[in-house]
Interface confidence: low
């Protein structure tokens, strides 16, 4: 059976004014609730979103029929109104109203911090109809609760456009210790303070936090949440992670790690790509950083050279990409090159060296003494030069280029002829009668073409003519020769 | 609550090594501090060394430092410790122990080690 | 390393009677991260006292510790038939952790 409740409700009209022929009753008493004598389950709706909880009102109903009393106000029936349990338990709870069975079409909707729960939810609407009223209850089941449970759930009737609506019933989830905040790793200058900050809640409340550094704890006693550490200093890495106790236990934050940024480690594997005669272009593999990022590198050239002075060249560059071409460099000599970096707290040792040598240059000076004549019985140019004075740096002389330019008449042009080292002579045909010929010559090695002697020119005369004076290579300082014929 | 569970007792020759494992169970996120700590027969307690199966940080006792090795496998929620270059005076029962809650601790039911030629 | 001295090394005492036990630390024990440890033959260590003077879960009152810095006590204030065992101090403030040689409490 279930017992009359008699309660205090404030009431609230629903209507302007009594109707037709009713009669008033007291507005106090609230309708008792019927004997069970059938009910009609209907589904409802439900879960979570939040809100503002409502506060409860009444509905004062009035009946039309001539002679019949005034109906007390509607309002749900008090309930309890706090429910605290533990996270992954069950809940059920519910509101219950009795409501005159002159109104059709009643319905009862739950919602949560102020926001109706739509969808999938346990929500049950019971009815047990009687003579005068319907006793409706509306039950509303939570399996497995969690956190976002948590929150103020009211009932709401709709009658005639008007809104009944029950006290809140309050459902506190309590569980072990949330973080909303944990410590993060960082990288600290040495004995320099640094703040950890570590929050975390409940329910239940109040949260207390241990602070644990290298499996100690750093406080003896615990801190209400949020904590703020305040470490003074540190001379080597240390791990950090608070403890969050409430009455339902313990929860720990993740180990975080603190290091003390140091100067980098050295640079490994310093690597050749690329070498030419006056530049070597390398690579490295950046050492550990020691926490505190890379500013920039120096590459340290030392000429490996018993008769150089050991000097070092230094060049600065870009700590990335890990690549520098070194430049002015001599050719086909031996260098040691280390790379070393820096970071805000300083540079680091020099990576292991490394040897790397230049390739054989060009030469650096011309064939001596070129001299051009023409020989008309053959129709040829000969042309002769002594070797040049070339540096061991140039490499080994593999032969000559000869450049011979041909004009006549605003035509030109120019051929090119290699010979080997060993000759120190060269015959060229005739390309154009009645022409001039301008001649240069260049030494070769493995390294490249060295510069051109200073050109010797010599005019070609048309067939019949005949003059044996050579051309040859000026004393310095004299303009370009010209043999005319 | 957590519970710690080690392996069986083990005989060693001198020279050998050899590697006690320490299972969580209870709670399988190992996520505290892991104490190994050792007691010759007749004699204390003697501190070994520090595990902290987060981030994989060891501390170990001086007088084990190059001999001693704590590591852990998160899959199946054991911590182990390997001891090397066995002597005689290594014999003991050698205990993994964790601080569960701050006021808590707990130990496990320890691993006999015998080193005998 | 921080080296703990406990004194007695033995203890006579009846049934009833209090025990007292020190631990004495060769440098200052950070923080009075000083613990203390009950072990019975064939058991491991069971822990009694941490943070110097507060009781872990489940260890009855008649178990105490007191004391800060170098100088700590433990002390049994009517000894119980379950309380002779070996008592350990450990200092956990550094590393390495240390602990004391043990002092035996056994039956008069």
């Known amino acids: 059976a279930i017992t009359e409740a008699r309660e205090e409700a404030k009431p609230y009209p629903l209507f302007p004014g009594p109707l037709p022929g009713s009669l008033q009753t007291d507005h106090t008493s609230l309708l008792s609730l019927p004997h069970t004598s059938g009910y009609q389950p209907a589904l409802m709706f439900s879960p979570t979103q939040p809100g503002r909880p409502y506060t409860g009102n009444v509905a004062i109903p009035r009946v039309t029929s001539a002679g019949s009393k005034l109906l007390p106000p509607l309002a749900f029936k008090h309930t309890v109104g706090h429910i605290i349990l533990s996270e992954h338990k069950d809940v059920k709870f519910n509101c219950s109203i009795s409501v005159p069975n002159i109104y059709q079409d009643t319905t009862i909707s739950w919602w949560k911090d102020g926001k109706e729960l739509l969808g999938a939810h346990h929500a049950i609407t019971q009815f047990y109809p009687d003579d005068e009223v319907t006793a409706i209850i509306a039950s509303f089941s939570i399996t497995s609760v969690q956190r976002s449970d948590n929150g103020s759930y009211i009932c709401k009737m709709k009658i005639n456009n008007e809104e009944i609506v029950s006290d809140p019933i309050y459902i506190e989830v309590q569980g072990l210790p949330h973080f909303t905040k944990q410590p993060e790793s960082m990288n600290v200058t040495r004995n320099t303070a640094f703040n950890l900050t570590c929050q975390a809640v409940g329910p239940p409340e109040p949260v207390n936090i241990f602070w644990v550094q290298n499996s100690s704890r750093v406080n003896e006693q615990p801190e209400k949440s949020p904590s703020v550490l305040t470490v003074p200093g540190l001379t080597e890495m240390a791990v950090f992670s608070c403890e969050a106790h409430n009455d339902k236990g313990l929860t720990v934050s993740k180990g975080v790690q603190i290091n003390i940024k140091a100067i980098p480690s050295p640079p490994t594997e310093v690597s050749i790509h690329n070498s030419t005669a006056h530049s070597i272009l390398i690579s490295w593999v950046p050492g550990f950083d020691g926490y505190s990022p890379f500013r920039n590198c120096s590459v340290q050239v030392k000429e490996v050279d018993p008769l150089s002075n050991g000097s070092v060249m230094i060049f600065n560059t870009s700590a990335s990409p890990h690549m520098y071409q070194i430049k002015q460099l001599q050719a086909l000599a031996n260098y040691s090159i280390g790379v070393s970096c820096m970071n805000e707290i300083g540079w680091s040792a020099v990576s292991p060296w490394i040897l790397a040598s230049t390739t054989e240059g060009a030469p650096s000076v011309a064939p001596l003494n070129v001299t051009v004549f023409l020989n008309e019985s053959r129709d040829n140019v000969d042309i002769r030069w002594m070797k040049p004075l070339t540096k061991r740096q140039a490499g080994e002389l593999v032969g000559y280029r000869i450049s011979h330019v041909w004009q006549s008449a605003g035509i030109s042009k120019e051929l090119l002829e290699e010979v080997g080292q060993n000759n120190s002579r060269a015959q060229i045909s005739v390309q154009v009668h009645n022409a001039t010929c301008t001649v240069r010559i260049a030494a070769v090695t493995k390294g490249g073409v060295g510069p051109f002697s200073d050109p010797v020119k010599i005019f070609i005369p048309a067939h019949g003519w005949v003059d044996h004076a050579p051309s040859s290579t000026p004393a310095p300082g004299n303009a370009d020769p010209v043999l005319i014929i | 609550q957590v519970q710690l569970v080690q392996s069986g007792a083990e005989v060693k020759k001198p020279g050998a090594s050899v590697k006690v494992s320490c299972k969580t169970s209870g709670n399988t996120q190992i996520r505290y501090y892991m104490y190994w700590v050792r007691q010759a027969p007749g004699q204390g307690l003697e501190w070994m060394g520090i595990l902290n199966p987060n981030q994989d940080q060891t501390t170990y006792a001086q007088k084990f430092q190059g001999r001693v090795t704590m590591t852990r496998d998160t899959s199946t929620s054991t911590v182990y410790m390997e001891l090397s270059s066995l002597r005689s005076e290594d014999t003991a029962v050698y205990y993994c122990?964790?601080?569960?809650?701050?006021?808590?601790?707990?130990w496990g039911q320890g691993t006999t080690v015998t080193v005998s030629s | 390393e921080i080296v703990l001295t406990q004194s007695p090394g033995t203890l006579s005492l009846s049934p009833g009677e209090r025990a007292t036990l020190s631990c004495r630390a060769s440098q200052s024990v950070r923080s009075n991260y000083l613990a203390w440890y009950q072990q019975k033959p064939g058991q491991a260590p069971r822990l009694l006292i941490y943070?110097?003077?507060s009781r872990a879960t489940g260890i009855p009152d008649r178990f105490s510790g007191s004391g800060s810095g170098t100088d700590f006590t433990l002390t049994i204030s009517r000894l119980e038939p379950e309380d002779f065992a070996v008592y350990y101090c450990?200092?956990?403030?550094?590393?390495?952790?240390?602990f004391g040689q043990g002092t035996k409490v056994e039956i008069k």
């Open positions: 122990a964790t601080t569960y809650r701050y006021y808590m601790d707990v």
């Open positions: 450990q200092q956990y403030g550094s590393s390495p952790r240390t």
């Open positions: 943070g110097a003077s």
